[in-house]
Every structure is written in structure tokens, then in C-alpha cells.
Interface confidence: medium
């Protein structure tokens, strides 16, 4: 004979637990049904009647099987520096992530609480570590033989062009200027851009730092809003 299936509410055997999607109600001392995601317990169970569930109201949700008396409130609307990547429904909370050019300075369980603009490295400084979804750009001074003449959150230090005859020597913020004879260059001309952080959790390739005789200051700056530090600009 097959074992009898107990219907909720029922008293569990001593030492046993309730089944999946049931909970033990301390007051009734019975195993009772949980409410499905998108619902909440409107009336708790008793010894003779099971849990009565009701749908979550607008702007509230439950994501799990539960027996809560009220659904959880969805988070506030996404701010102007954020993108809504998941809408508030009866079964899930709203999720806000940072828009391109910003990173998450203060995260929460899902999504971002506070976005901050990616740091821009000023001329003479290049990107040592690109920004990601959750970390800011790190700037470093351009090593001898390299330069950056832009204010950018993506440009790395590039090698000076190699001249047959130098008209103006290059420095950290300016390329070398050659006389009219055509220059040779170890890298293709034009700005080198690093990828912007995107809202998916993709891996970014980091620029290979070129050998440097400059001090090894990594310019690791605190997350979150802060005054512009050396090598970076607030704009």
C-alpha cells in the first residue's frame, strides 16, 4: 500500500520537518503551505485551515515561497545615472545598474545603490587599470618615452613617435614632433581606447603596463565621490 499523503495543515511526526514549500507554524504547531512567489500570507493557518494567500499589491513583490504577512516594497525608481535592468513585478524587485561611463561605488545585493562617474586621467597620465562595473579607473603617470595628451577614462599612455630628426622632444603630455622627414612609430598612430565598462559582468583585458622608471605610485584612489586626485579630473 502506498504511504498516505498528508494534506496541509498536518502535525509533523516528532523529529521530522515539514515538506518542501511548507513551513512549521509555531502557533498552530502544524505544517502549513507557503505562498508562492508573487503572493503573501493573508491569513495564517490554524489547526483546521491552511494558509490563505493573496497576490502582492502594486510596487510590492515576493521572490521566494514565503509566509510573510506583507509583500516587500520594490526599491525606488532608478536615478538618472542608472539604467533599469529589471522591472518591479509581483515576483521580483527592480534592479538598477550604472549607465555607461559610470561605475557602482556602493552596491547592494542585486544592482547598485550609488553610481559614480568613471575617473578621467588628465594629460600626462594614462589608464593603468580600466574601470569595471564596480571599480573606478586607476590613472598612472606616463613613463619616459610615452605620453597621453587627452583627458580620458579609456586612453592609455602611448609611445612617442620615433623621429629621424626631432623638432620638439616629446614629454608625458605631448608626442614628439618630427622634422618633415617621415617618422617611424612602434605603435599605430591614433588614440588607444580601452573598453568602457558595460552592464554585463564581462571581463576586461587590462593594458599591459610598459616598463617604467617613474615612481611606482599606483594611484589607487578611494571608491565613491572624492575630490579629484593627481592624474585625474572630475569632469
Amino acid at each position: 500500500l502506498p504511504a498516505q499523503v498528508a494534506f496541509t495543515p498536518y502535525a509533523p511526526e516528532p523529529g521530522s520537518t515539514c515538506r518542501l514549500r511548507e513551513y512549521y507554524d509555531q502557533t498552530a504547531q502544524m505544517c502549513c503551505s507557503k505562498c508562492s512567489p508573487g503572493q503573501h500570507a493573508k491569513v495564517f493557518c490554524t489547526k483546521t485551515s491552511d494558509t490563505v494567500c493573496d497576490s502582492c499589491e502594486d510596487s510590492t513583490y515576493t521572490q521566494l515561497w514565503n509566509w510573510v504577512p506583507e509583500c516587500l516594497s520594490c526599491g525606488s525608481r532608478c536615478s538618472s545615472d542608472q539604467v533599469e535592468t529589471q522591472a518591479c513585478t509581483r515576483e521580483q524587485n527592480r534592479i538598477c545598474t550604472c549607465r555607461p561611463g559610470w561605475y557602482c561605488a556602493l552596491s547592494k545585493q542585486e544592482g547598485c545603490r550609488l553610481c559614480a562617474p568613471l575617473r578621467k586621467c588628465r594629460p600626462g597620465f594614462g589608464v593603468a587599470r580600466p574601470g569595471t562595473e564596480t571599480s573606478d579607473v586607476v590613472c598612472k603617470p606616463c613613463a619616459p618615452g610615452t605620453f597621453s595628451n587627452t583627458t580620458s577614462s579609456t586612453d592609455i599612455c602611448r609611445p612617442h613617435q620615433i623621429c629621424n630628426v626631432v623638432a620638439i622632444p616629446g614629454n608625458a603630455s605631448m608626442d614628439a614632433v618630427c622634422t618633415s622627414t617621415s617618422p617611424t612609430r612602434s605603435m599605430a598612430p591614433g588614440a588607444v581606447h580601452l573598453p568602457q565598462p558595460v552592464s554585463t559582468r564581462s571581463q576586461h583585458t587590462q593594458p599591459t603596463p610598459e616598463p617604467s622608471t617613474a615612481p611606482s605610485t599606483s594611484f589607487l584612489l578611494p571608491m565613491g565621490p572624492s575630490p579629484p586626485a593627481e592624474g585625474s579630473t572630475g569632469d
Epitope: Y23, Q26, T62, Q63, L64, W67, V68, L72, Q109
Partner: nanobody, 124 residues
């Protein structure tokens, strides 16, 4: 699934203090409340305190009000039970348990996941 591990139990003299820890791991922890229960030989399991991981709201059994304090560290996913002015009748195995979603409605009505428990003995 939520996993819970208690620690911090021990032998203490009446009037002494202990702090229990409940380390939680798993998804959706912010939806849960963590409650402390105790079991003593010959007694029914008793709800001691509860804290909502999201709101931080708390509840206590009358027998421990003013002596026990429950707190949480969301960064470490850990709940603490600070027990002061301990009495022999506080002796028992203390378990933490989790429940969706809060404990605004009194101590836990039910529980999903249990830790193994930590023994607290109050004796001179």
C-alpha cells in the same frame, strides 16, 4: 538554500555574559529573518529573539527582554546574540534558524533552515 553555523557557546557563571554568532550563507539572505531558539532538556523549544536582515527590526521573548540583544552585520552575513545577566534557566542548546522575510510580526512563526546549535551552560 541557506546554511547556518552557530558559535560562541560555553560554560558561564550566573550573572555572566556570552555572545553567540550565527554565520549565514546562501542566496537571498536579505529576504530572511534570523531567529534564535533554545532547547533545554525536558522543555519545549523556545523562541528567544529574531532580527530582520533587511529592516533590522527585532523581537524578543519576554523571558530575555532587557538582558539579550540581537544584532546583525550584513557585510559579514552574521547575526549576534549578546546575552548578559545570564541565569541557570538560560541553559540549553541555542540554534539559529532562518525564515522569510521578517520578524515584525512577533517571533518566528516558522523556519526554513536550522543550524546545528551551540551549547550554553549557566552554572556556578
Amino acid at each position: 538554500e541557506v546554511q547556518l553555523v552557530e558559535s560562541g557557546g560555553g560554560l558561564v557563571q550566573p550573572g555572566g555574559s556570552l555572545t553567540l554568532s550565527c554565520a549565514a550563507s546562501g542566496r537571498y539572505l536579505e529576504y530572511y529573518a534570523i531567529g534564535w531558539f533554545r532547547e533545554a532538556p525536558g522543555k519545549e523549544r523556545e523562541g528567544v529573539s529574531c532580527i530582520s536582515m533587511s529592516a533590522g527590526s527585532t523581537n524578543y521573548a519576554d523571558s530575555v527582554k532587557g538582558r539579550f540583544t540581537v544584532s546583525r552585520d550584513n557585510a559579514k552575513n552574521t547575526v549576534y546574540l549578546q546575552m548578559n545577566s545570564l541565569k541557570p534557566e538560560d541553559t540549553g542548546v541555542y540554534h539559529c534558524a532562518s525564515e522569510p522575510y521578517g520578524c515584525e510580526d512577533g517571533l518566528l512563526r516558522g523556519y526554513d533552515y536550522w543550524g546545528q546549535g551551540t551549547q550554553v551552560t549557566v552554572s556556578s
